[in-house]
């Protein structure tokens, strides 16, 4: 149900963040909020309270700003959603950031069984393991899948991937969370070969040159089947 | 469609307590500021209380600091709001919302609206 009276506003601005949403702890990160042209001011919120303002260089680009956080900790960890003012009018808010510290406590194990390489529709599962008590597990593959996977456990989480196919090869890691927006260091990549089977172009290799410090994924929860929800996670990779 | 609905509301004596429920359904909860506001008889529907998205930020009205606390499980899409030291003026209809605001107190800026609960606070 919407309510009757509507508050005048401008579209949406958009927000990514460089170089990526996960940050090491002490790491800096930039924001980027991009609105229109005529903004003359634009405003960073972080979880609902303002974080900082930023006015366009008018030697630059005049539709985005970027803000800069040069020591992320638990404490800016979290989501940020931007605005732009554009005479009298107020943006509507952009889509929600989420920026999450990596590189707290401790760093967990990560195996995978019955072995790291494995022939085509063998049923694989990966185990996450950290010896500091935490909330949830989440379970990564570097580019290539865009998925995420997490699993609630105190010590230990498994994350079974049942019959693989050759879209599973890949590097992966895993985090334990201490919150949502707090992560353990990552753990040491795993990387799963798939052997045997016809080869599949459609379902290409992870890309050997990814960066192993930049990660690029969606949220998935396989809790209830695999839901995604690119939005919230959407870093927009724009220069 | 989106879907909030409220429960919990209620007759209450004077001083007495409430948890109000808020459930939303076809919505990224996590992904939304929740809210709650109040509207009595003859007066403006007026903001009491509203939570970040991950929990991390709370903002209350004045008239209820101290005696209010919202909360949230984006696990389970729910928002709470707990009512403490009820007043007879704590009489309202009260309306559970979801937005991204600029001003988590401004009506105007939240998106989607339940229907509401009835509490009621007699002396």
């Known amino acids: 149900q919407r309510i009757n009276t509507e508050k005048e506003t401008l579209p949406k601005p958009i927000i990514w963040a460089k170089p990526s949403i996960m940050v090491t702890n002490g790491n800096s990160v930039n924001i980027w909020c991009q609105g229109a042209q005529s903004a003359s001011e634009y405003q960073l919120y972080f979880e609902g309270s303002f974080f900082a303002l930023e006015r366009p260089k008018p030697s630059r680009s005049m539709n985005k700003v970027r803000f800069f956080i040069s020591q992320m900790t638990s404490h800016t960890a979290g989501i940020y959603t931007c605005f732009y003012q554009s005479g009298e009018l107020w943006s509507k808010s952009s889509n929600p950031l989420k920026l999450v510290v990596t590189g707290l406590y401790d760093t967990p194990n990560l195996w995978v069984y019955p072995r790291p390489e494995v022939t085509l529709g063998e049923n694989v599962t990966f185990f996450c393991q950290l010896k500091t008590a935490t909330s949830k597990f989440f379970l990564l593959k570097e580019r290539g899948s865009n998925h995420i996977q997490n699993k609630y456990g105190n010590i230990q989480a498994e994350f079974p991937m049942g019959p693989v196919t050759r879209a599973h090869r890949g590097t992966y890691r895993c985090f334990g969370s201490y919150n949502d927006y707090a992560w353990s260091f990552p753990s040491e990549p795993v990387t799963l070969l798939i052997t045997g089977g016809v080869e599949n172009s459609s379902l290409a290799p992870t890309d050997p040159t990814s960066s192993l410090d930049y990660w690029e994924f969606d949220l998935s929860t396989n809790e209830s089947g695999l839901q995604k929800d690119s939005a919230f996670w959407d870093h927009t990779t724009q220069n | 469609d989106v879907q909030l609905q409220e429960s919990g509301g209620g007759l209450v004596q004077a001083g007495g307590s409430l948890r109000l429920s808020c459930a939303a359904s076809?919505?990224?909860?996590?992904?939304?500021?929740m809210g709650w506001f109040r509207q009595a008889p003859g007066k403006e529907r007026e903001f009491v209380a509203a939570i970040s998205y991950g929990a991390v930020n709370t903002f209350y009205t004045d008239s209820v600091k101290g005696r209010f606390t919202i909360s949230r499980d984006n696990a389970k899409n729910l928002v709470y709001l707990r009512m403490n030291s009820l007043t007879v003026e704590d009489t309202a209809l009260y309306y559970c919302?979801?937005?991204?605001?600029?001003?988590?107190?401004?009506?105007?800026?939240?998106?989607?609206w339940g229907q509401g609960t009835q509490v009621t606070v007699s002396s």
């Open positions: 076809g919505v990224t909860f996590s992904q939304y500021i």
């Open positions: 919302a979801a937005g991204r605001p600029r001003q988590v107190s401004s009506k105007l800026e939240y998106d989607y």
